[in-house]
């Protein structure tokens, strides 16, 4: 008889990414005997929760919990039953809940309580539901990208762990309600709040991170809409031939539009607004989102926020990817340089509604917003973060790495389950022939 080698036992972990516009569930898996290896944890499956983000259930907290049931049922299927009890389950909420917590902390608590109530009903090892800080969201996204791309440590053929020569990758995340930029830097931080020191696999990393609340794609679109209502009788970023009725209550209920909110307005009033396909006015409208007037540090990105010069290569994911991918794939426009990105944004903003629909059939939902989205991404990267043509050449727009979605969720789980040791693995792997 010969021994049949059984496949290594797998462990699983579940993270619910409760974003501002929707919630996604990610199930991760890894071989139980290789927990400390880098890049060994991968995505097993995922599930999109139907409906809006949990912050949209402020008036109906129970619904926030119940909305997760379908995906949790999928988790019961996707994770082998004998692993359920040992599978950690986390829920992390981001900027949508940060905003709700600012405006209505009681509702925010009620939503998290309801979600917790639902998650504790399941046989997984539930380890809490909480709101991540912007700093955590940025850093965990950076950890995810670099972990998946195996930038922290590498396993050499001689059986020794070594740190690869290539540096780490910066991470840029564009969510629904906030955007994050995170990268390794040698410059000491002039603002302590933006510096995070990490020790991973025995290596020390000094990381700059900042999260801009209200600069996520959905909130930017709301702010531009509020500005258009305030300054124009039309929306320069919407295509000509497109018009819709805007409910004022929807526009002004967000704390992000408070600056444009009239002193008195009828929240139930509907205002008709039409697009005008005006790239130049649209650019002006988007420019109004950034302030460069004062900087209390030696250098800033925008709004008086300290930022060292961008350094190294970057991965831009989530809505950065979706926006650029639309320009590249749906519109067939080149976006390899900043100049091309700007030209692509202008191209989209010049299109009429009929032209856009003909060009991109069957994508009605957000079609009218791609002009504003493209203008914002272009301005955020060039004027906001200070990418020049050379630095922009080092930016890759990608939503996945190693078949795993890039975002804060994996980094969060790796951190909370101690899957990234602070010190390098003590045991040698394999044989040293030297």
């Amino acid at each position: 008889t010969r021994d049949i080698r059984e496949p290594p036992a797998l462990k699983y972990g579940i993270v619910l990414d409760a974003g501002s516009s929707h919630t996604s569930m990610f199930i991760y898996k890894w071989p139980a005997d290789k927990e400390n290896d880098t890049g060994i944890v991968g995505q097993h499956s995922s599930c999109d929760v139907p409906g809006g983000g949990i912050s949209s259930y402020a008036d109906n907290p129970s619904g926030a919990g119940q909305s997760l049931v379908g995906c949790l049922e999928q988790a019961l299927r996707d994770v082998p039953k004998e692993r359920h009890a040992g599978t950690p389950l986390y829920l992390g909420a981001t900027a949508g809940m940060r905003l709700l917590n600012l405006t209505n902390p009681e509702a925010s608590t009620s939503v998290l309580t309801a979600v917790t109530h639902t998650l504790t009903q399941y046989p997984f090892d539930f380890r809490g539901a909480r709101i991540l800080s912007g700093q955590e969201e940025g850093v965990f996204g950076w950890v995810t990208a670099n972990y998946l791309l195996e930038n922290f440590i590498k396993y050499g053929w001689v059986g020794r762990w070594f740190r690869p020569r290539k540096g780490t990758l910066g991470a840029m995340d564009l969510g629904g309600a906030s955007t994050q930029i995170t990268f390794e830097t040698t410059s000491p931080a002039e603002d302590r709040a933006s510096e995070v020191q990490l020790r991973l696999y025995g290596q020390h990393y000094r990381v700059y991170t900042h999260s801009f609340l209200c600069y996520g794609r959905d909130q930017v679109l709301q702010r531009l809409l509020a500005s258009a209502l305030q300054t124009h009788s039309f929306h320069p970023c919407w295509p000509r031939g497109f018009s819709t009725h805007v409910l004022l209550g929807d526009v002004y209920q967000s704390p992000c539009t408070v600056a444009q909110r009239p002193q008195t307005f009828n929240s139930s009033a509907r205002v008709s607004l039409s697009g005008s396909s005006d790239p130049h006015l649209c650019r002006d409208l988007v420019s109004g989102l950034f302030s460069f007037s004062s900087c209390p540090f030696s250098r800033c990105s925008f709004n008086g926020v300290f930022q060292p010069p961008v350094a190294g290569n970057f991965i831009a994911f989530s809505a950065f990817f979706y926006t650029v991918n639309f320009l590249r794939t749906s519109m067939g426009l080149p976006v390899a340089t900043l100049q091309q990105l700007e030209a692509a944004a202008v191209n989209v903003c010049n299109q009429t509604w009929a032209q856009l629909q003909a060009r991109v059939p069957g994508q009605q939902a957000h079609l009218a917003d791609y002009c504003a989205g493209a203008m914002f991404v272009q301005q955020l990267l060039s004027r906001g973060y200070g990418f020049d043509e050379r630095a922009f050449g080092g930016v890759i727009f990608q939503k996945k790495a190693a078949d795993t979605a890039v975002g804060w969720a994996l980094g969060y789980m790796l951190n909370l389950t101690n899957l990234i040791p602070a010190d390098p693995p003590g045991l040698r792997k394999g044989t040293d022939f030297s």
Epitope: N60, S62, G63, G65, Q66, S67, V69, L72, E73, L76, R77, P80, K81, A114, H117, T118, L119, T120, Q121, Y122, P123
Partner: antibody, heavy 120, light 109 residues
Framework: QVQLVQSGAEVKKPGSSVKVSCKAS????????VSWVRQAPGQGLEWMGR????????QYAQKFQGRVTITADESTSTAYMELSSLRSEDTAVYYC?????????????WDQGTLVTVSS | SYELTQPLSVSVALGQTARITCSGD??????VYWYQQKPGQAPVLVIY???NRPSGIPERFSGSNSGNTATLTISRAQAGDEADYYC???????????FGGGTKLTVLG
């Protein structure tokens, strides 16, 4: 402690419909779903369908699809089960049962049931 | 469609151990729940998640589940345990609850 209270016994003619109510007393349907289970005389339990009251989300057993409608009125914490095109084999005790969102505690609160008799 | 099969009846001597089985295709991969129903009464949950007891259910009741068979075990059976017992499982594929046909437990002596 939440209790479920159902409407009284009904006698119906074949081909007609019956609507049974189930009210949560001492609490609401907050974070719970409500299932309807029936039991014909001397027979076993048979699941008919469920509703998540605050979402209005329903699921039905294939056998009853198109003949059963489950609704809920959140304001009164009452769930309803309506069964149409009644036939004699629908004579049964109809139970409403509360289930937690994750099925972890399955049906933890039941009412005593409503007897529906279908007879010409 | 998924089905659960139970023996029609099981007898046990007073004070002895009763075992009621519930078989279904790969039932060990699903969670099984057990209900006790006495004549003229609504069912009562006695076991959830294969082997967990809700508060108020005596320790004499236990459950196990693997392979194609789930088992409800009642040790030191008492006259008051005489009832119909139903196993149930949630069929995730079809999003529906499935009940076994029920087992009548008779306590002799």
């Amino acid at each position: 402690q939440v209790q479920l209270v159902q409407s009284g016994a009904e006698v119906k003619k074949p081909g007609s419909s019956v609507k049974v109510s189930c009210k949560a007393s001492g609490g609401t349907f907050d974070s719970y779903a409500v299932s309807w289970v029936r039991q014909a005389p001397g027979q076993g339990l048979e699941w008919m369908g469920r509703i998540v009251p605050w979402l209005g989300h329903t699921q039905y057993a294939q056998k009853f699809q198109g003949r059963v409608t489950i609704t809920a009125d959140e304001s009164t914490s009452t769930a309803y089960m309506e069964l149409s095109s009644l036939r004699s084999e629908d004579t049964a005790v109809y139970y409403c049962a509360r289930e937690s969102p994750g099925y972890r505690y399955s049906f933890d609160v039941w009412d005593q049931g409503t007897l529906v008799t279908v007879s010409s | 469609s998924y089905e659960l099969t139970q023996p029609l009846s099981v007898s046990v001597a007073l004070g002895q151990t009763a075992r009621i089985t519930c078989s279904g295709d790969a039932i060990g991969e699903k969670y099984v729940y057990w209900y006790q129903q006495k004549p003229g009464q609504a069912p009562v949950l006695v076991i959830y998640d294969d082997n967990n007891r809700p508060s108020g259910i005596p320790e004499r009741f236990s459950g196990s589940n693997s392979g194609n068979t789930a088992t409800l075990t009642i040790s030191r059976a008492q006259a008051g345990d005489e009832a119909d017992y139903y196993c149930a499982s949630y069929d995730l594929q079809q999003a529906r609850w499935v009940f076994g046909g029920g087992t009548k437990l008779t306590v002799l002596g």
